[in-house]
Amino acid sequence: MNGRVDYLVTEEEINLTRGPSGLGFNIVGGTDQQYVSNDSGIYVSRIKENGAAALDGRLQEGDKILSVNGQDLKNLLHQDAVDLFRNAGYAVSLRVQHRLQVQNGPIGHRGEGDPSG
């Protein structure tokens, strides 16, 4: 691939209200399920249509979730991270890292597993 792919990394606090079917997204990652090479962080892999996250509109597939209600998600097993979300209560505050691809030069291919979503 010619050209260079850069990333613009931003952080955002997203406050979600749990809907009738929950928060409405899927995650990958954890110390026992590294989705991104050399990174055991937790990433959003799916936003469910008409779920709380989709209706809010800010959380995106590929986002890295840094904390839930102030609790850091570093060094968690995958299932422990899942359980943390499930037990997070009605009002859930997510600290999220968005990683936006900035293309310089010819268009490149972003493969599955790239955290840019």
Epitope: S21, G22, L23, G24, F25, N26, I27, V28, Q33, Y35, S45, R46, K48, H78, Q79, V82, F85, R86, G111, E112, G113
Partner: nanobody
Framework: EVQLVESGGGSVQAGGSLRLSCTAS????????MAWFRQAPGKEREFVAA??????YYADSVTGRFTISRDNAKNTVYLQMNSLKPEDTAVYYC?????????????????????WGQGTQVTVS
């Protein structure tokens, strides 16, 4: 885009066994939640079994007879079907979604899955 290809279907006598396979594309297969559904003629598609990071789930009608397993090195999920009955006759579909839901997992809800195979016919006589 995840592609799913099922194989292993066929015809068998009641009491016999079959093993279905579903091979998926993608290099992060170990993160997929995988499931098998089936649809008999004139009936709605029904849940059979699923396997997520946290374990396996089965429909009551197949518990003790069917076993779901996966081989992450081969990007494949299996459905071992023993003690087959005529009522197991159906087209069997593989389904997948990337990751684990942060909500209560409903393995039998087809809306939990984004990707579906074309199906493989199982006939028990």
């Amino acid at each position: 885009e995840v592609q799913l290809v099922e194989s292993g279907g066929g015809s068998v006598q009641a009491g016999g066994s079959l093993r279905l396979s579903c091979t998926a594309s993608g290099r992060t297969f170990s993160t997929y939640t995988m499931a098998w559904f089936r649809q008999a003629p004139g009936k709605e598609r029904e849940f059979v079994a699923a396997i997520s990071w946290s374990g396996a789930y089965y429909a009551d009608s197949v518990t003790g007879r069917f076993t779901i397993s996966r081989d992450n090195a081969k990007n494949t999920v299996y459905l071992q079907m023993n003690s087959l009955k005529p009522e197991d006759t159906a087209v069997y579909y593989c389904a997948a979604v990337i990751g684990s839901t942060v909500d209560s997992y409903r393995p039998g809800d087809h809306l939990e899955y984004d990707y579906w195979g074309q199906g493989t016919q199982v006939t028990v006589s």
